[in-house]
């Protein structure tokens, strides 16, 4: 039950990007939310042929991808930190999964350009803000109330059913003259009513 609720809360997480708050902020959509994770897009110029791209979370290296060419122009792609990454002609995408509040931070794309020379390092980044959507907040507020109300209704229903069942059972089992007594009560009521009218 606990794990089910945990997955629900994770499902409710949404991602918002606040860029332009830091020097060297990305002038493109750096964070793309999909499949319960985030794709962090690190772009580099088309002319760059050999480079190292590091994904930094604050000052910590999360991911690392290096593309180089040997003396015979053979391409080598090396990943020091194991991350799910994707390389294209002008970008490296790093994928983060199972997001929670601890993922909220400044993320930087640290690009080291080896080729063409001169050697150059550029840093671009943005803030990955994880928040819970309004719908989920409402759901989280009303869900326990709804559940509690449902439980209360169920309990009351059970009590009512039990009470009715008990009443029926007691009246049929403990008083064999119940029908006769009922008739007597009716007759008595009729007599008193007639008396009232006469007076």
């Amino acid at each position: 039950m606990k794990s089910g609720l945990w997955y629900f809360f994770l499902f409710c997480l949404r991602i918002k990007v606040l860029t332009g708050e830091i020097n060297g902020s990305a002038n493109y959509e750096m964070f793309i939310f999909h499949n319960g994770g985030v794709q962090i897009l690190c772009k580099y110029p088309d002319i760059v042929q050999q480079f190292k791209m590091q994904l930094l979370k604050g000052g910590q290296i999360l991911c690392d991808l290096t593309k180089t060419k040997g003396s015979g122009n053979t391409v080598s792609i090396k990943s020091l930190k194991f991350c799910h990454s994707q390389l294209s002609n002008n970008s490296v995408s790093f994928f983060l999964y199972n997001l929670d509040h601890s993922h909220a931070n400044y993320y930087f794309c640290n690009l080291s350009i080896f080729d063409p020379p001169p050697f150059k390092v550029t840093l671009t980044g943005g803030y990955l803000h994880i928040y819970e959507s309004q719908l989920c907040c409402q759901l989280k507020f009303w869900l326990p109330i709804g559940c509690a109300a449902f439980v209360v209704v169920c309990i009351l229903g059970c009590i009512l059913i039990c009470w009715l069942t008990k009443k029926k059972y007691s009246s049929s089992v403990h008083d064999p003259n119940g029908e006769y007594m009922f008739m007597r009560a009716v007759n008595t009521a009729k007599k008193s009513r007639l008396t009232d009218v006469t007076l």
């Epitope: 002319i47 042929q49 050999q50 290096t66 180089t68 060419k69 040997g70 003396s71 015979g72 122009n73 053979t74 080598s76 090396k78 080896f114 080729d115 063409p116 020379p117």
Partner: antibody, heavy 117, light 111 residues
Framework: EVQLVESGGGLVQPGGSLRLSCAAS????????MDWVRQAPGKGLVWVSN????????NFAPSVKGRFTISRDNAKNTLYLQMNSLRAEDTAVYYC??????????WGQGTLVTVSS | DIVMTQSPDSLAVSLGERATINCKSS??????????LIWYQQKPGQPPKLLIF???TRQTGVPDRFSGSGSGTDFTLTISSLQAEDVAVYYC?????????FGPGTKVDIK
């Protein structure tokens, strides 16, 4: 300062074997492709072999393919060239060279390999 | 394999004069706007030294009297004013594809 120091050269008989080593210092060895280039006495430069950062990609000149193997130990900052079935035409100064992304920017002083009976 | 040829085999130039070395490749070395050609200098008893890469980009620390030009299959190394310390053999090399190959070299002497 980048330094490459070759060792292991010497005189060997045809058909024999030799293992060359290249000790690297002054740079992050694992960040670079490394190569072996040879030069026969009084002749020009001939590329022999190369290896990528972690040894996953290896290339050889057609003249040595199947006889030579290249390897590296990044923990020891050392490049190796294992030469088997040596021939007289393999006689040369063997240079260890760092491929600096777009050229051989650092070379060792070389080690002489002489194949003769 | 790409074959590299150089001309002349050797040349003698007076001190302060211009020296020109040519290099030709058997196929174009131009790709993505770059010419995959390198020039090295090798002095007697020494390993080669990088001079020029990408056909025309001078390596850091190389005197500006050395310049490279050309594109596609034809390339030139020029020493604008020859100095005594420039006496050496000069090699061109391509890195367009595997295997990378060197030219046979051009020996430069003082006249």
């Amino acid at each position: 300062e980048v330094q490459l120091v070759e060792s292991g050269g010497g005189l060997v008989q045809p058909g024999g074997s030799l293992r060359l080593s290249c000790a690297a210092s002054g740079f992050t060895f694992s960040d670079y492709w490394m190569d072996w280039v040879r030069q026969a006495p009084g002749k020009g430069l001939v590329w022999v072999s190369n290896i990528d950062h972690d040894g996953n990609i290896i290339n050889f000149a057609p003249s040595v393919k199947g006889r030579f193997t290249i390897s590296r130990d990044n923990a020891k900052n050392t490049l190796y060239l294992q030469m088997n079935s040596l021939r007289a035409e393999d006689t040369a100064v063997y240079y260890c060279a760092r491929w600096g992304h777009y050229a051989f920017d650092s070379w060792g002083q070389g080690t002489l390999v002489t194949v003769s009976s | 394999d790409i074959v590299m040829t150089q001309s002349p085999d050797s040349l003698a130039v007076s001190l302060g004069e211009r020296a020109t070395i040519n290099c030709k490749s058997s196929q174009s070395l131009l790709s993505s706007g770059y010419n995959y050609l390198i020039w090295y200098q090798q002095k007697p008893g020494q390993p080669p030294k990088l001079l020029i890469f990408y056909a025309s980009t001078r390596q850091t620390g190389v005197p500006d009297r050395f310049s490279g030009s050309g594109s596609g299959t034809d390339f030139t190394l020029t020493i604008s004013s020859l100095q005594a310390e420039d006496v050496a053999v000069y090699y061109c090399q391509h890195h367009y594809s595997s295997p990378p190959t060197f030219g046979p070299g051009t020996k430069v002497d003082i006249k």
